[in-house]
């Protein structure tokens, strides 16, 4: 369960891939599309508000008692819109919704690299946000070796 309903911290950052492509958001036909693209020099990067929540891992699963804490994040590129995992379509979508947010909007934060993060679906363990054909998609990671796969690694930057 997520500890409390308010985030422990919030962080406004631009999101880019391991290969330094930017994640951008465009309003098209009253809905937002998500793109993975190379920005031109000096082109402004889109910012995402990351809200960090503590989540207690159930002690019967972890063996940690009260010690098994995970860090969950929600990602909001614009007011009232959040990234959602659509597990049926294996897609990542922007949905407008009110709080409390649904579980599909929460992602377990991983560091597989000192300056990169990965986002694992709360609703589908082992499935991560990744890059596929210049779009964000949900990618199944079937072994710990594949956790370092570049297409699920993202960089957060304040600039």
């Amino acid at each position: 369960s997520i500890t409390g309903i308010s985030p422990i911290t919030e962080y406004l950052a631009s999101l880019s891939t391991y290969n330094d492509q930017s994640i951008t958001f465009a309003l098209e036909d009253e809905s937002y599309e998500i793109y993975v693209e190379d920005l031109k020099k000096d082109e402004k990067k889109d910012k995402v508000l990351l809200s960090y929540y503590e989540s207690q891992h159930p002690s019967n699963e972890s063996g940690d008692g009260v010690d098994g804490k995970m860090l969950m994040v929600t990602l909001s590129p614009t007011k009232d819109f959040w990234l959602h995992a659509n597990n049926k379509e294996h897609s990542v979508e922007l949905h407008k919704c009110e709080k409390p947010l649904p579980d599909q909007a929460f992602f377990v934060l991983h560091n597989m690299h000192s300056n990169c993060v990965s986002f694992e679906c709360k609703t589908d363990p082992g499935v991560f946000i990744g890059v596929k054909d210049n779009h964000l998609a949900l990618i199944k990671v079937d072994s710990s070796e594949n956790l370092c796969t570049e297409n699920i690694l993202f960089k957060l930057s304040e600039t």
Epitope: I8, T9, Y11, A13, Y52, E54, H57, S62, G63, D64, D67, G68, K69, M70, L71, V108, L109, H110, N111, M112, H113, S114, N115, V117, E120, S144, E145, L147, C148, L156, E158
Partner: antibody, heavy 122, light 107 residues
Amino acid sequence: EVQLVESGGGLVQPGGSLRLSCAASGFTFNNYWMTWVRQAPGKGLEWVASITYTGGGTYYPDSVKGRFTISRDNAKSSLYLQMNSLRAEDTAVYYCTRANYYYNTYGGFPYWGQGTLVTVSS
Amino acid sequence: DIQMTQSPSSLSASVGDRVTITCLASEGFSNDLAWYQQKPGKAPKSLIYAASRLQDGVPSRFSGSGSGTDFTLTISSLQPEDFATYFCQQGSKYPLTFGGGTKVEIK
């Protein structure tokens, strides 16, 4: 109860090697990043090495890079620090620490071992 | 590298005093900042994480604040067991770095 117990410290000559161990218990070891931090006598704290929860990534400051190697055995819930080409300035108490959350580095080090003293002297 | 400058390096205070320790970073970063307390011959103990979150079991007289480059640890009413050395640490960018420490002594 989370426990981290370091061992392997001692007196070693300059240029020598030493292997520190940290036995972890009371938590799911393979879900956490682990880190070594050291403290020279009468001085402050210095980060020495970190390793990802899977063991696939390792990180070091320039002061120890190429000389120290951090590793882990998740099956044994153990963390190691192989120290080669030791110098007088490596003399310190070495602490084994555990990250705050599963899978990531955020939130500092809530758990520390008691430390093991490494003395590099001829 | 992010340099963490703690001030003061030492201070003298009495039981009941309000004590403030600051940590200044050489560049701004997300609020992945922790504070530790250390007593002679002992391992450091985590007090605060995420700049302002109290670690489990830490008395509420300890509090943390700040963001960007300026961070503060406050002890609202100093107790006898609080005389120790305090360190800040940033975890936002590698290499991980600590402040030089602040020794809180009895006046």
